[in-house]
Interface confidence: low
Amino acid sequence: SWMWNQFFLLEEYTGSDYQYVGKLHSDQDRGDGSLKYILSGDGAGDLFIINENTGDIQATKRLDREEKPVYILRAQAINRRTGRPVEPESEFIIKIHDINDNEPIFTKDVYTATVPEMADVGTFVVQVTATDADDPTYGNSAKVVYSILQGQPYFSVESETGIIKTALLNMDRENREQYQVVIQAKDMGGQMGGLSGTTTVNITLTDVNDNPPRFPQSTYQFKTPESSPPGTPIGRIKASDADVGENAEIEYSITDGEGHDMFDVITDQETQEGIITVKKLLDFEKKRVYTLKVEASNPHIEPRFLYLGPFKDSATVRIVVDDVDEPPVFSKLAYILQIREDAQINTTIGSVAAQDPDAARNPVKYSVDRHTDMDRIFNIDSGNGSIFTSKLLDRETLLWHNITVIATEINNPKQSSRVPLYIKVLDVNDNAPEFAEFYETFVCEKAKADQLIQTLHAVDKDDPYSGHQFSFSLAPEAASGSNFTIQDNKDNTAGILTRKNGYNRHEMSTYLLPVVISDNDYPVQSSTGTVTVRVCACDHHGNMQSCHAEALIHPTGLSTGAGSEFRHDSGLNDIFEAQKIEWHE
């Protein structure tokens, strides 16, 4: 049988001779050279050679365990004379023994990591890892220990895990942002003689909101003209914040002060400035200086840093309002005046008043905008603003006069203002009532006494406060011996009644009745209107047949019949029905 133990060979042999591995030997070998040893398998004849007589094996080259830790070969023992094996072919192993010939190598040449500033001691930053190619199962050649060569006292490394942690309290990004840490990995458990490798870790402190905004000055002063419309920016203020990003975002607000409702502050998102703007119209004459308290605060607050104090700061903003030469201001936005229509020329209607709002209180002069009073009906006293008539008025022609008055600063004519005047003309009873239409009617020859043949209506251009009250009567010269009577209905109408039985058209074909219409206002106005009554032949039904030698003419000039087209009072319908009449030559 074969006689050997497992073969071991030290790697990286540096001797000048071949390295002896071991001896193959069969108990059949009597030492007389009758046996021949043959080697085959991994590296046989190249890396490993055998003395075929003695069975001694040697390595011809330096071996690297990290390249190949085990070689598997086969051994044969042959009888030289017969050529037959004296032992069965057998497999054996040459195991390469490790030496510490590899240093630890980090997985990265440079690591980058971040950690929040002000982090607690022991906060995890990053884990570095080094590997050692030597045999971890034998000795300490591959036992790696980590240590920090550069970066203390800020950071530490756990010797076994390579975990880097913060080691110093209150590391402040605003003081120092970048750190370069050098970590060493050493094998042999870190003992003397161990091999080592290093890596660099670039650590950046990330920002946390540990700094409040701060105004660089406690007071700001801005000027703005009183004419600045709402929304006008009048100045910028800027608080500084040592933080970055959203931690440096600043919101501005007006927290106090007499101008809280007059001004606003908005945040410019790009520049992080507070823009003071006008909120309401300013008036130099009312208030010339405003003092505001403006606050700058961080929107993104980290509660754990609230102990550092409030994350806001205040500044005083003084705003000086500059005077602007303003036009005169009328005492009212519009004036409503009234005057009787019978007013004489130069009658004063009322007055307007305007004043220069500026401190100078420049005197003003008044005038009428002639584009609004082309007929020059009104005038104004340029000094005191009194409005007076310069022509006679007529309410029935124009009830309202809408004119514009201009107030101009005497010292600066460019500064002027306008105000509307609405002048109402009050009614005076200066118009007489008159017939509402032209009245021409007829009576049948066979008419009975006290028959209604026409109802009268009147109109009046005036507009009395208590309404119209008209009275109707026959003119005095016609009242005695008249063939007709007027019946006043006391409702602003009157009726014409027959006064006798029967009329003869051959004796009198036409009657002209003068009717007096009076109103009831002061002074009383009256007029006389004439009603034409024609005597007509009628049939036994009362239908008109002929009225002398002409037809009845409607005021419009159209031929008409009595009745529906020529509207008689309904009382007439008892006498005749509506019917067209014929022309009689």
């Epitope: 607000s253 607050i301 509660p303």
Partner: antibody, heavy 120, light 106 residues
Framework: QVQLVESGGGLVKPGGSLRLSCAAS????????ISWVRQAPGKGLEWVGF??????????NYAAPVKGRFTISRDDSKNTLYLQMNSLKTEDTAVYYC???????????WGQGTLVTVSS | DIQMTQSPSSLSASVGDRVTITCRAS??????LNWYQQKPGKAPKLLIY???NLQSGVPSRFSGSGSGTDFTLTISSLQPEDFATYYC????????FGQGTKVEIK
């Protein structure tokens, strides 16, 4: 970047329960108050409730229509907000959004929403 | 509860138009008024906070004004991407939204 992602929506019968989640990332979740908002189909936005940060004692507040039925909670270690909805009604059908409450009382980041349908 | 009333409820406008949306609170809300834009199927997006402050990343054609009870959102020159629904929201006492204003293409 700041992200809010809602999940847990679905179909539920009237009277049933549902729990919505809102996973946050890209900001210090524990420092912010977070709100739930809903929007019924084709309708406007309606505030549901909010929960303040740890620094403010995790105070909660609810809109009148959901008070007593809905509960908001949070797990800062998981960066997650929850909305527990009980005794659901058909009028609770809506897309539910979570939104980060920023200083000056506005909501600067919203999730994409999750649909809750309450129907028999 | 504070009620928020938006007007108009919808409007039609063309690209380049100046658009104004108003929002009225039932009681004073100081300046705690925010404006949001919402497009179909999307979450609302903050445009203006505290009545007049432009949210970072929002185009400068959007502006807000007002205080007390009356507030306005103005789009100085309407762009194609601005067609959406706009909501006002008060944050003075809890939160309530306006009913929304839909801006459509004319």
């Amino acid at each position: 970047q700041v992200q809010l992602v809602e999940s847990g929506g679905g179909l539920v019968k009237p009277g049933g329960s549902l729990r919505l989640s809102c996973a946050a990332s890209g900001f210090t979740f524990s420092s912010y108050a977070i709100s739930w908002v809903r929007q019924a189909p084709g309708k406007g936005l309606e505030w549901v409730g909010f929960i303040k940060s740890n620094a403010d004692g995790y105070t909660t507040n609810y809109a009148a229509p959901v008070k007593g039925r809905f509960t908001i909670s949070r797990d800062d270690s998981k960066n997650t907000l929850y909305l527990q909805m009980n005794s659901l009604k058909t009028e609770d059908t809506a897309v539910y959004y979570c939104a980060r409450i920023r200083y000056f009382r506005n909501w600067d980041y919203w999730g994409q929403g999750t649909l809750v349908t309450v129907s028999s | 509860d504070i009620q928020m009333t938006q007007s108009p409820s919808s409007l039609s406008a063309s690209v380049g138009d100046r658009v104004t949306i108003t929002c009225r609170a039932s009681q004073t809300i100081n300046s705690y008024l925010n404006w949001y834009q919402q497009k179909p199927g999307k979450a609302p997006k903050l445009l203006i906070y505290r009545a007049s402050n432009l949210q970072s990343g929002v185009p400068s054609r959007f502006s807000g004004s007002g205080s007390g009870t009356d507030f306005t959102l103005t789009i100085s020159s309407l762009q194609p991407e601005d067609f959406a629904t706009y909501y006002c929201q008060q944050g003075d006492s809890s939160w309530t939204f306006g009913q929304g204003t839909k801006v459509e293409i004319k």
